[in-house]
């Protein structure tokens, strides 16, 4: 039974090549977290995914695919406001040691210019476990569609655990959710990155317990400033 690496519950394999900005952060050969390619040199993920060194898998929906790019990364920059106690500001930029080669299978994610409203249908993706609490890690990238939930409705579930830069998503009475191994991975709505998988209740996929994401639209300035600062 695992926790900090994360998963997709009640989803299905993503359409091949539909998430070319999706990356996996590996510890050695093992999945640690998901992430997204922001540009040739930078990956965005969750702050709680921090390690000393990362191997970044890009360019294939299948972990272990020998055609995939694997790039080492040894520098990462957490949001300075990240709290290990409340998990607010749960995002981090990882700088690749060498540039990613862009292709039809490796593309930059679109950062948001606005925050999408509650009710918007979005897709969360990852290689995290598809069962919980016992784990079953897929080799192929999994996707599930969820809807953004208003802060008012989400607060009914999570009370004061919810901070204002956290975003909730789920489907009422459904198990559809992220889980162990999906952390740091993308929640994409109308073609733009709106969330990064942050946390949820456990075992994963409990109906009416939404997934909680870092609300990326609140952090675009920090993302751009940090990449510029550490060029």
């Amino acid at each position: 039974e695992e926790a900090q690496g994360d998963k997709i519950i009640d989803g299905a394999p993503c359409a091949r090549g539909s998430h070319p900005w999706q990356v996996a952060l590996l510890s050695g050969n093992q999945l640690h977290c998901g992430g997204v390619l922001v540009n040739e040199r930078w990956v965005l993920t969750a702050a709680h995914c921090k390690m000393n060194e990362y191997t970044v898998h890009l360019g294939s929906d299948t972990l272990g695919d020998r055609r995939a790019q694997r790039i080492k990364a040894s520098k990462s920059f957490r949001h300075p406001g990240y709290s290990t106690q409340t998990h607010v500001n749960d995002l981090m930029l990882v700088k690749l040691n060498s540039q990613a080669r862009l292709s039809s299978m490796v593309k930059k994610v679109r950062l948001p210019s606005r925050c999408e409203p509650p009710g918007t249908t979005c897709t969360v993706s990852g290689w995290g476990t598809t069962t919980s609490p016992d784990v079953t890690f897929p080799s192929d990238l999994m996707c599930v569609d969820v809807k953004l939930i208003s802060p008012q409705d989400c607060t009914k579930v999570y009370k004061d655990l919810l901070e204002n830069s956290m975003l909730c998503a789920g489907i009422p009475d459904s198990k559809k959710n992220a889980c162990n191994g999906d952390s740091g991975g993308p929640l994409v709505c109308r073609g733009t990155l709106q969330g990064l998988v942050s946390w949820g209740t456990f075992p994963c996929g409990q109906p009416n317990d939404p997934g909680v994401y870092t609300q990326v639209c609140k952090f675009t300035k920090w993302i751009n400033d940090t990449m510029k600062k550490h060029r």
Partner: antibody, heavy 122, light 108 residues
Framework: QVQLVQSGAEVKKPGASVKVSCKAS????????IHWVRQAPGQGLEWMGS????????NYAQELQGRVTMTTDTSTSTAYMELRSLRSDDTAVYYC???????????????WGQGTMVTVSS | DIQMTQSPSSLSASVGDRVTITCRAS??????LNWYQQKPGKAPKLLIY???SLQSGVPSRFSGSGSGTDFTLTISSLQPEDFATYYC??????????FGGGTKVEIK
């Protein structure tokens, strides 16, 4: 087999330090957090702190701040808890425990070590 | 910090009895409360998580209920192996994780 195996009993003098180890097996050590909980003879459970095996992030109980250090060695899947400036009231069984959860949050202890008795006596 | 108060601190019961233990939080912890069983010389063992979910492998005579500040652990028909000390804890507002003081269930 999923388990946490702790180091053996220790007898220490007041003012000394003790370092207890907790070796994980049967699961991905870096995907979990390890917590330390102690229990004085005939008393209840007291949370001491936690460490993320992957990031090294720590949170310590306020009353132990400055005396306790938690570390991990990912190459051996082992967590360590060092307690310094020992006093007689630190005499307790020390447990490591794995916290179950997903992502940044954890919700309960689903796996415990067998415990390590630390006796502080002059 | 959230304080957890368990009652009673001890109780005597007979095999077959229905036993109820309560845990009260000093402020609302939603349903993020867990129950553990500890036998002498052994580590605690998870029984119930999230106030009411039974941990895999735990007999169905154990059940949990409650939300907010008041929680109950019930053993529907006490068995000889159930004589132990029971603890609640909260993972809602952390750190710190806080435990109740324990309830010792003894043979009458």
């Amino acid at each position: 087999q999923v388990q946490l195996v702790q180091s053996g009993a220790e007898v220490k003098k007041p003012g000394a330090s003790v370092k207890v180890s907790c070796k994980a097996s049967g699961y991905t050590f870096t995907s979990e957090g390890i917590h330390w909980v102690r229990q004085a003879p005939g008393q209840g459970l007291e949370w001491m702190g936690s460490i993320s095996a992957s990031s090294g992030d720590t949170n310590y109980a306020q009353e132990l701040q400055g005396r306790v250090t938690m570390t991990t060695d990912t190459s051996t899947s082992t967590a360590y808890m060092e307690l310094r400036s020992l006093r007689s009231d630190d005499t307790a069984v020390y447990y490591c425990a794995r916290a179950a959860g997903y992502g940044a949050r954890h919700w309960y202890f689903d796996l415990w070590g067998q415990g390590t008795m630390v006796t502080v006596s002059s | 910090d959230i304080q957890m108060t368990q009652s009673p601190s001890s109780l005597s019961a007979s095999v077959g009895d229905r036993v109820t233990i309560t845990c009260r939080a000093s402020q609302s912890i939603s349903s993020y409360l867990n129950w553990y069983q500890q036998k002498p010389g052994k580590a605690p063992k998870l029984l119930i998580y999230g106030a009411s979910s039974l941990q895999s492998g735990v007999p169905s005579r154990f059940s949990g209920s409650g939300s907010g500040t008041d929680f109950t652990l019930t053993i529907s028909s006490l068995q000889p192996e159930d004589f132990a000390t029971y603890y609640c804890d909260q993972f809602y507002s952390t750190p710190p994780i806080t435990f109740g003081g324990g309830t010792k269930v003894e043979i009458k």
